[in-house]
Every structure is written in C-alpha cells, then in structure tokens.
Interface confidence: low
C-alpha cells in the first residue's frame, strides 16, 4: 500500500495473507468460513510450493493470539483467467477446515448487485504489499482510502486505453495506491467487498495508471458455484 498508514489491529477481520512457503505472497479476503477469495495470478509461479492462508493477523512476524495458518485443501482459479490478461483474475482457496471465527476472524459480505460503485465513493484497500518504490515490505497491515474512478476516465488512451471491461473497476492512484503484494486483497466500499486487487506489473502511485480491481458482483454466479 503506497501513501497509506498502518491499519488498526484486527479491525479488518476478513483480511487474509496468502503465503507461499511461509512468506507473504498476496492478499486475500475471507468470504465464507472455509473460503478465501484472492487473485488467480498470485499462484502462477507457485509451482510445487506450499500455499497456506494466514488469518487473524496484523503483524506477519509477531505472535498474536488470533493468528492461525491454514493449509489449502483446494485452489480454484477462475476458469477463464490467463497469464497474459487482467481479466477474470480471481482465485478461491478452500481452507483445510472451517476457520475458527472470532473478533479477529470473520467473513466479509460481498456485493452481489451487479451495478457500478458510484465514482468518487471512498473505498478501503488493505494489504501487506510494498509501501514505497524501493520495495519495502511492511510487517503490519497497511490500508488506504481511495476514491472510485469512473470507467470512461480509466479507459482513456493515457490511462488504461480501453482495457477496463464492465467486470473491472478502477480507483484513483495519485500517490495513494495498492501495489505489489497487495494483489488479491479486498477493496471494501460501505462495509461490503466490491473489488479484488488485480495482480500484474502495473506501475503504482501514478495518477495516470489507476488501480484496477476485479468486481466481485460480476462473478457472483461463479463464486456461488464454487462455494456450493
């Protein structure tokens, strides 16, 4: 997270760290007792590594009573996700068992009404991604509030040049932005999960390259079919 600040500890009980061989790889969001939603591209280079999900965490390194690392029973990338596009960049991870819920671990309601969030709406994005252009990784969860950007502006030739389909949304990126390591994390508007940070090599913090988020409402049928 660029230009943000440390989050209040455990105030985002839905927040997950998707880990590869014990190290933070991507963000994720608990959407059901046994399911975490993240970004498909996160597992592209996982190969034979051990993928796990950390829940109830604020600090990645310090012991916390609510922290628990879960093995992954099943990883379900969206069937249409492809390495070279940002489209359909969603991944559902089934935990090895139902998460133990509590004040620091709780699923987040996700948006099902397939309607764009109004431009200018302030949404919260959180993650353990890099906090500066030098690539410094934080130990504790960071967050930032970002205004939603209308699709027409986001699709300008100087911005994302038509790449933002109706299944994607954008948020402003002027010095405050999500970045590498935040992929798969939640974009939360009005207490509801609206978007998932897309993974990719987008430049962060540049106002002409807005943050891109997968709209979960556009994938409600797929999410339901996997969780059923």
């Amino acid at each position: 997270i660029l230009g943000g600040r440390e989050a209040e500890a455990h105030a985002r009980p839905y927040m997950a760290s998707v880990q590869l061989n014990g190290a933070h790889l991507c963000g994720g969001v608990l959407v059901a007792e046994q399911w975490v939603l993240s970004a498909a591209h996160c597992l592209e280079d996982a190969a034979d590594g051990k993928v796990q999900v950390l829940l109830g965490a604020h600090s990645l390194s310090q012991p916390e009573p609510s922290k628990r690392l879960y093995d992954v029973l099943r990883a379900v990338p969206h069937p249409d996700s492809q390495p070279d596009t940002i489209d359909h960049d969603l991944l559902l991870l089934q935990l090895s068992e139902k998460a133990t819920l509590g004040p620091a671990v709780r699923p987040l309601p996700w948006q099902r009404v397939d309607r764009d969030v109004a431009p200018g709406t302030l949404c919260d994005v959180a993650g353990w991604g890099i906090v500066n252009h030098a690539g410094r990784r934080p130990d504790s969860l960071q967050h930032v509030l970002l205004p939603v950007l209308d699709r027409a502006t986001c699709n300008r030739r100087t911005h994302h040049d038509g790449a933002i389909t109706e299944r994607l949304m954008c948020a402003e990126s002027n010095r405050r932005d999500s970045c590498k390591g935040d992929s798969g994390g939640p974009l939360v508007c009005g207490g509801v999960l609206e978007g998932v940070v897309t993974s990719g090599s987008r430049v962060c913090g540049n106002r002409k390259k807005p943050g891109i988020y997968t709209r979960v409402a556009s994938y409600a049928a797929w999410i339901d079919s996997v969780l059923a």
Epitope: P13, V31, A32, E33, L101, G102, P103, R106, P107, P109, W110, Q111, R112, V113, D114, G191, V192, A217, A220, A221, D224, S225, A228
Partner: antibody
C-alpha cells in the same frame, strides 16, 4: 421499492402439505438470498432456511431440513416454500425475507413479506 | 445452535425515557447481532445489524452496542410509536437464531 408479496392464508389437515409463494419486486431477484422464517407464539422467530435464487442452492436449519423444500421460479421472481407432514405445531405465520445488500446472510433480513398464516387442524 | 436469550419479556417505559433492551448469546457471536422491531399486525423491521449499524431510514434514537455474548438495543428518547416487540438475532453462523422478544409497553 422492494416488495415481497406472499400468498394467502392456508387451512390444512394434519399430515398434509402446504406450499407458500413469495413474489418479489422492486429489486434484482437473483441478487439476494431469500430466507424463510416461522413465527409462532411458543417459539418466537425460527429461521427455516434460505435459497440462492441465482443458483437454486439451499441452506436449511437442521430442524426443518427433512420437511421443508425451498424453490424459486426466476422467470416470475417468485420463491416458494413447501412444508410437508404437517402437525398442529406447524400452525404459525410464515415469512419470506431477503438479506440486505449482500448475498451472504450475514447482515440480517432487511425486507419481509406480509406473512402467510398456516393453520393445521382436523 | 446458538441460543439468544432476551431475559425481559416485557418492559414498561414512558415517552421521553431512555430504555435499554438486552440480549445474551450462548456463545461469543463476535458482534454479529441484528435487532428487529415488530409492531402489532406488521412484519418485523430490521433496525440494526453488526451490533451498531443502523439500517436505512432508522431514526438515530435507536443505537446498538455490545460484544462477546452481551448486546443491548437502546432507545434514547422513547416515542409512542416505539411501542412494539423487539427481537435480537445472531448473524454469526447458521442456523440464524432469534431471541424470544421483548415487548416494550408505554406507561
């Protein structure tokens, strides 16, 4: 304006079945789970189960699982609850209710039908 | 199943008074509690969810608080139209369960 219009009162005999309808309007029917709730003076409010109108997927309260069947007709934006093998204890008002802004039933039931009175009597 | 207990079946109050209706869960429900108001002859109406978030259009005299197993609905200045049954409900895990209700009576 969100509206849930339920079918009228039913007088049924013990051992019979009843099927109640709930017609939704004013919102995208498939975007919200539909819940069914039993209201009796003895047991207060009891959640029977819910159905995802988009997929037809159901979750039942174990207490009602053997006797309740939830279905939807997407073309008419109508949800149905069938209750079989009725006894006098099933005499109650039955409500349909949708969840608030999220398909997950985490945040309570924001919109309710007017209720359907079912009386089980010989 | 999680049992929600509203120990007071009836509460008597006067217009303008402050009143608190309590609800106790049989286990920690992690602030996942909603409150409903049901007036005679009407369907229940959602007032509050996630312990303290007011539903659209609910007057700000209604506030919710609590954590763990203990939750409270407070009406800061009771109005005559607040005469009703009030139910708590946990939305922590299925099956969603309700309290037995508290009937608010106006003296």
């Amino acid at each position: 304006e969100v509206q849930l219009q339920q079918s009228g009162p039913e007088l049924v005999k013990p051992g019979a079945s009843v099927k109640i309808s709930c017609k939704a309007s004013g919102y995208s029917f498939t975007a919200y789970y539909m819940n069914w709730v039993k209201h009796s003076p003895e047991k207060s409010l009891e959640w029977i189960g819910d159905i995802n109108p988009s997929t037809g997927g159901t979750t039942y309260n174990q207490k009602f699982k053997a006797r309740a069947t939830l279905t939807v007709d997407k073309s008419s934006s109508t949800a149905y609850m069938q209750l079989k093998s009725l006894t006098s204890e099933d005499s109650a008002v039955y409500y349909c209710a949708t969840t608030y802004y999220s398909g997950n039933s985490y945040v309570g039931f924001a919109y309710w039908g007017q209720g359907t009175l079912v009386t089980v009597s010989a | 199943d999680i049992v929600m207990t509203q120990s007071h079946k009836f509460m008597s109050t006067s217009v303008g008074d402050r009143v608190s209706i309590t609800c106790k869960a049989s286990q920690d429900v992690s602030t996942a509690v909603a409150w409903y108001q049901q007036k005679p002859g009407q369907s229940p109406k959602l007032l509050i969810f996630w312990t303290s978030t007011r539903h659209t259009g609910v007057p700000d005299r209604f506030t919710g608080s609590g954590s763990g197993t203990d939750y409270t609905l407070t009406i800061s200045s009771v109005q005559a139209e607040d005469l009703a049954l009030y139910y708590c409900q946990q939305h922590y895990t299925t099956p969603w369960t309700f309290g037995g209700g508290t009937k608010l009576e106006i003296k």
